[in-house]
Amino acid sequence: SLGSLTIAEPAMIAECKTRTEVFEISRRLIDRTNANFLVWPPCVEVQRCSGCCNNRNVQCRPTQVQLRPVQVRKIEIVRKKPIFKKATVTLEDHLACKCETVAAARPVT
Amino acid sequence: SLGSLTIAEPAMIAECKTRTEVFEISRRLIDRTNANFLVWPPCVEVQRCSGCCNNRNVQCRPTQVQLRPVQVRKIEIVRKKPIFKKATVTLEDHLACKCETVAAARPVT
């Protein structure tokens, strides 16, 4: 419901931190030449840095990253029947974030 | 750290539900005619539907939406001095989500 008229509360800044985002598993990540298959699941959750910083010269960026391999199903349709295969996709999770100057290269440990 | 070699766990679907997202408060939301000002905060958190559904014919869409007015600061620079004014921005939070067929219009209560 849109609710009754409410007092406008002060807006709170969305601080620079990790948040859960949805990552789409594109078929082209699995197989670039063949389009006759499905990927399951089609999307997964990842942790990503987001939010804003005090001024436009700094950006919210990851300072620590972890690569996470996950197993997906590649479902090929052969003679109208599904054939299940396994494939691995490497996801990127951000573990820590920082407001960094735009031009600075960021270290990833 | 990029971590050592780990076993690929089965990927879990990012289900259709509300997640916290970052909404950038564009200056054009406050004043379309004047660009000589800053907005604070530059971004806020909102709740939005995201995730994926069982097939491509359905999409994760909000079934319930709430409008939330928030107060931001409009900082005008006049003769090199900041002048603080208040402005209200109406944010849209998604309260509930559902996998709906793409063609269907979504009811918002």
Epitope: F23, E24, R28, R32, C49, R61 | -
Partner: antibody, heavy 120, light 107 residues
Amino acid sequence: EVQLVESGGGLVQPGGSLRLSCAASGFTFSSFWMTWVRQAPGKGLEWVASISAGGGITHYPDSVKDRFTVSRDNAKNSLYLQLNSLRAEDTAVYYCAESGGDIYSDFDYWGQGTLVTVSS
Amino acid sequence: DIQMTQSPSSLSASVGDRVTITCRASQSISNYLNWYQQKPGKAPKLLIYAASSLQSGVPSRFSGSGSGTDFTLTISSLQPEDFATYYCQQSYSTPLTFGGGTKVEIK
């Protein structure tokens, strides 16, 4: 249809800076690693920088390390290359390319390139 | 760094000819080898990836072979639109490196 459009090239003096942009469309930009490759006039191809899908991992060759910075804004489907302390030998056409699911992939789609000329 | 050496640097051929270009890596790169075609004033175009996989939309007259250090790009019957410069590239380790290129010209 996949499209990559570079911009931001131009004439700059030695020691100067430039920021290149690459606008992506036609694919899920946030799912793919992206790369910059350059080509000096009449010369071959040289890899310049790569960035992971989420922007958390970057790779550079020694020739540009500490001078060039690659970044991306997935919300805007945009890739960037900040060029600092430019030298005459950085004069080249700079291409952005989509490079698959990791650094060890091929360069599947390319933009048309933007020319950077470093000269006094 | 892995050096990629292409040969020849240029060749002249006629339409219908079979053309072979070789690429040698300074150390083993398994099958992490890609081939690109570039025409003057244009961006490179991916032809072959993973040494022998034909990129979608590329004519079947192009083929790739090899593993380890020695690789070959073959054009079985050269067509007018194939006159261009060809580059190999290793994606086995960083820095990613390209061969010097092979220019295929009309005889």
